[in-house]
Amino acid sequence: SEVEYRAEVGQNAYLPCFYTPAAPGNLVPVCWGKGACPVFECGNVVLRTDERDVNYWTSRYWLNGDFRKGDVSLTIENVTLADSGIYCCRIQIPGIMNDEKFNLKLVIKPAKVTPAPTRQRDFTAAFPRMLTTRGHGPAETQTLGSLPDINLTQISTLANELRDSRLANDLRDSGATIRIG
């Protein structure tokens, strides 16, 4: 039930996770961990944000997007085969028990012997394509956990957040955005 992403050894891997702050700068704590989302928090935390800033991170793991606008997608630098596995993005929405859990599966492939053109490699490194195709509706909610009635008024596709990106079509079905407020 995890959404699957791929990257090649030596590239940067990109694992998307988004939410829409209720108001500009009104941030929500987020944690990223290696391994499926546990009951609480994130196991083996690699990065954490609070209401103001990134307050914990480990080497090679960073947020490349504007986390102040809710882009908490994780970039893993210079991946190796050991980076394969499930990663947990947990958006700790304020209120009674409103956490949203996303389990994303990263598959690392050995580097190709013949490198692809630079432009294509750059795109692939930043935004690896999904391996699994997901439709909208019930199947998509499998990656979301429960959606509380309060504070969550809309789920939109990742492509909406990236509508100005030339890669929007590639990413149309590759994730979900939580809107708060």
Epitope: P29, A36, V39, F40, E41, D50, M97
Partner: antibody, heavy 115, light 107 residues
Framework: DVQLQESGPGLVKPSQSLSLTCTVT?????????WNWIRQFPGNKLEWMGY???????SYNPSLKSRISITRDTSKNQFFLQLNSVTTEDTATYYC????????WGQGTTLTVSS | DIVMTQSPSSMSASLGDRITITCQAT??????LNWYQQKPGKPPSFLIH???ELAEGVPSRFSGSGSGSDYSLTISNLESEDFADYYC?????????FGAGTKLELK
């Protein structure tokens, strides 16, 4: 290693308030994790009651919402359960537990509600 | 609340046997399921996370499977230390809810 130890009165009268303490050693309760209370009724049914996490955020089981409060004292590395208006139905063994998956548990403290 | 129906409530088996305990949720819980073991007079201990992932130190004779609303715990080649109570826990949705437990006894 994380160690937890519950302490409490053992016997409480109906309609009174119950206060339990969980003392944590080997780890700071402000570093990480959710710090939970779970109870086990006679007959062994388990019920999750609520938690306070490392940043002080709390969350409670809605079935107890009006009666429960979980607080902490970071200077003593302790967290607390208060349950108001207890009845005989609250007779149980109370555990404090933490970790992402309830990895660490106290030994439990038995509470009897009786007049 | 999500109700976890665990079966059987008790069972007896012999050393070396293979047994399976099941948990059924009242809705799809998307693999958000853990298993715990409890021995008499002790607190529960963490056994399996996210359906299949064994907790640290758990022997490989324990395994989990399932998806949607149906999950199972299998113990192969039962050893004496495995006779205990077992509980499933769903954490897909709050409040967290446990199964009623399965008591595994020596035949």
């Amino acid at each position: 290693d994380v160690q937890l130890q519950e302490s409490g009165p053992g016997l409480v009268k109906p309609s009174q308030s119950l206060s339990l303490t969980c003392t944590v050693t080997g780890y700071s309760i402000t570093s990480d994790y959710a710090w939970n209370w779970i109870r086990q009724f006679p007959g062994n049914k388990l019920e999750w009651m609520g938690y306070i996490n490392y940043s002080g955020r709390t969350s409670y089981n809605p079935s107890l919402k009006s009666r429960i409060s979980i607080t902490r004292d970071t200077s003593k590395n302790q967290f607390f359960l208060q349950l108001n208006s207890v009845t005989t139905e609250d007779t149980a063994t109370y555990y404090c537990t933490s970790g992402g998956n309830f990895d660490y548990w106290g030994q439990g403290t038995t509470l009897t509600v009786s007049s | 609340d999500i109700v976890m129906t665990q079966s059987p409530s008790s069972m007896s088996a012999s050393l070396g046997d293979r047994i399976t305990i099941t948990c059924q949720a009242t809705q799809d819980i998307v693999k958000n399921l853990n298993w715990y073991q409890q021995k008499p007079g002790k607190p529960p201990s963490f056994l399996i996370h996210y359906v299949t992932e064994l907790a640290e130190g758990v022997p490989s004779r324990f395994s989990g499977s399932g998806s949607g609303s149906d999950y199972s715990l299998t113990i192969s080649n039962l050893e004496s230390e495995d006779f205990a109570d077992y509980y499933c826990l769903q954490f897909y949705e709050f409040p967290l809810t446990f199964g009623a437990g399965t008591k595994l006894e020596l035949k």
